[in-house]
Interface confidence: medium
């Protein structure tokens, strides 16, 4: 686990008017072993909408690291390898559940938060504007 | 507040022995309110490797419904809106964090939990084996 | 498909309290929030607060804070709006309104209000 | 809050005609904007979710565009059944605003 300097602001769990706060049991489940997927690791480069990923770190979050993908072209890779700008590398974005120290640097407190994520890049048809 | 027939085997909130357990504020807090996200919605026809969206409920489950993409084809679309079976459409995964209830019908008690969710299709090229 | 019955009309006097209820059957009231919206008479539409029953939670339009209590009964599938404090401005027709929990596409679609109750009307008078 | 203001207030239509209501947000929602329909002595329905996306078991001359602050609810053909207030709602940022509402009938 990690060491936090706690805060003397912490709540205190048994504090009746904690907003709306429960218990939650941070020992992860994970349901994907039994599925045991194929990792997407390598489609971020055989794509035709190839993305990089840049790593997100937040220590006050978790999970803490949080990869984010970005488009490496604004068209998408045709068949000989070249920049179509005919079609539009997008990003896949996602909005996943966090959780965040609140107050800061508190160990065992935490406020369930949203975050928009891009998961990885398609190719897509654009949208043409045709003005009148 | 909700009112839910408790369980009687809901764990104390006190108990020290409580496996690595938090309090967290369930007011979910939206850190996606500066980027006011235009959403994907439309990508999954656009794309060169569509997706469908298949609904997987679990009422014990935050969130309780969750659409899974389902990839159209083996193949990707091509140019002239055929399917180019050259290329693969594949599922984009993420794992995400869901909240479940634990034991069931617990008000005041979850489990973090890991899924993997297939969030959309991109279109890749395929891995060729050659036969000796 | 899930339907929503609202309790009766009511009639009030100003100070008064009022709590109206909401019954929602088919499919599963934990996968869905419900939220409560009023309609003074000619008026348009007002949002004043909502619950996610599998979570608990509940959020309240400033306007109506410290006024209004939102709370769900799983066991009865049943949400209540209380409002307290009446006065005449409260007149209106209350609606309780479904909101899905659904993940859907990438995102929370957890916002829009796809089912309606069919209204409780409320008269506040002397 | 977010203020949304609906344009025109009223719109005396006739039967096959188009028909379009405006919606436009005091700051921008991302496309967190949905659309009713609601008949007289009737509760609201929903038409439109998140600007664009259809609704199961809603006639399809029904559809909605837009993002950012200006959003459109356009009716193509407009039939008597028709007839009623349409109220545009943002789901962005607490508290959840509707428009004033555009009270459509039929000439």
């Known amino acids: 686990g990690i060491t936090i300097p706690r805060n003397p602001g912490c709540p205190n769990s048994e504090d009746k008017n904690f907003p709306r706060t429960v218990m939650v049991n941070l020992n992860i489940h994970n349901r994907n072993t039994n599925t045991n997927p194929k990792r997407s690791s390598d489609y971020y480069n055989r794509s035709t909408s190839p993305w990089n990923l840049h790593r997100n770190e937040d220590p006050e979050r978790y999970p803490s690291v949080i990869w984010e993908a970005k488009c490496r072209h604004l068209g998408c890779i045709n068949a000989d390898g070249n920049v179509d700008y005919h079609m539009n590398s997008v990003p896949i974005q996602q909005e996943i559940l966090v959780l965040r120290r609140e107050p800061p640097h508190c160990p065992n407190s935490f406020r369930l938060e949203k975050i928009l994520v891009s998961v990885g890049c398609t190719c897509v048809t654009p949208i043409v504007h045709h003005v009148a | 507040g909700i009112t839910i027939p408790r369980n009687p085997g809901c764990p104390n909130s006190e108990d020290k022995n409580f496996p690595r357990t938090v309090m967290v504020n369930l007011n979910i807090h939206n850190r996606n309110t500066n980027t006011n996200p235009k959403r994907s919605s439309d990508y999954y026809n656009r794309s060169t490797s569509p997706w469908n969206l298949h609904r997987n409920e679990d009422p014990e489950r935050y969130p309780s419904v969750i659409w899974e993409a389902k990839c159209r084809h083996l193949g990707c679309i091509n140019a002239d809106g055929n399917v180019d079976y050259h290329m693969n459409s594949v599922p984009i995964q993420q794992e995400i964090l869901v909240l479940r209830r634990e034991p069931p019908h617990c008000p005041n008690s979850f489990r973090l939990e890991k899924i993997l969710v297939s969030v959309g299709c991109t279109c890749v090229t395929p891995i060729v084996h050659h036969v000796a | 498909e899930v339907q929503l019955v609202q309790s009766g009309a009511e009639v009030k006097k100003p100070g008064e309290s009022l709590k109206i209820s909401c019954k929602a059957s088919?499919?599963?009231?934990?996968?869905?929030?419900i939220s409560w919206v009023r309609q003074a008479p000619g008026q348009g539409l007002e949002w004043m607060g909502g619950i996610t029953p599998i979570l608990g939670t509940a959020n309240y339009a400033q306007k109506f804070q410290g006024r209004v209590t939102i709370t769900a009964d799983e066991s009865t599938t049943t949400a209540y709006m209380e409002l307290s404090g009446l006065t005449s401005d409260d007149t209106a027709v209350y609606y309780c309104?479904?909101?899905?929990?659904?993940?859907?596409?990438?995102?929370?679609?957890?916002?829009?209000?796809?089912?309606w109750g069919q209204g409780t009307t409320v008269t506040v008078s002397s | 809050e977010i203020v949304l203001t609906q344009s025109p207030d009223f719109q005396s239509v006739t039967p096959k005609e188009k028909v379009t209501i405006t919606c436009r947000a005091s700051?921008?929602?991302?496309?967190?904007l949905h659309w009713y329909q609601q008949k007289p002595d009737q509760s609201p329905k929903l038409l439109i979710k998140y600007a664009s996306q259809s609704i199961s078991g809603v006639p399809s001359r029904f559809s909605g565009s837009g993002s950012g602050t200006d959003f459109t609810l356009t009716i193509n053909g407009l039939e008597a059944e028709d007839a009623g207030t349409y109220y545009c709602?943002?789901?962005?940022?607490?508290?959840?605003?509707f428009g004033q509402g555009t009270k459509v009938d039929i000439k």
């Open positions: 088919g499919g599963s009231f934990r996968s869905y929030g």
């Open positions: 309104a479904r909101v899905p929990n659904d993940f859907w596409n990438g995102y929370f679609a957890t916002d829009y209000f796809d089912d």
């Open positions: 700051q921008d929602i991302g496309s967190a």
């Open positions: 709602h943002q789901s962005t940022s607490l508290p959840h605003t």
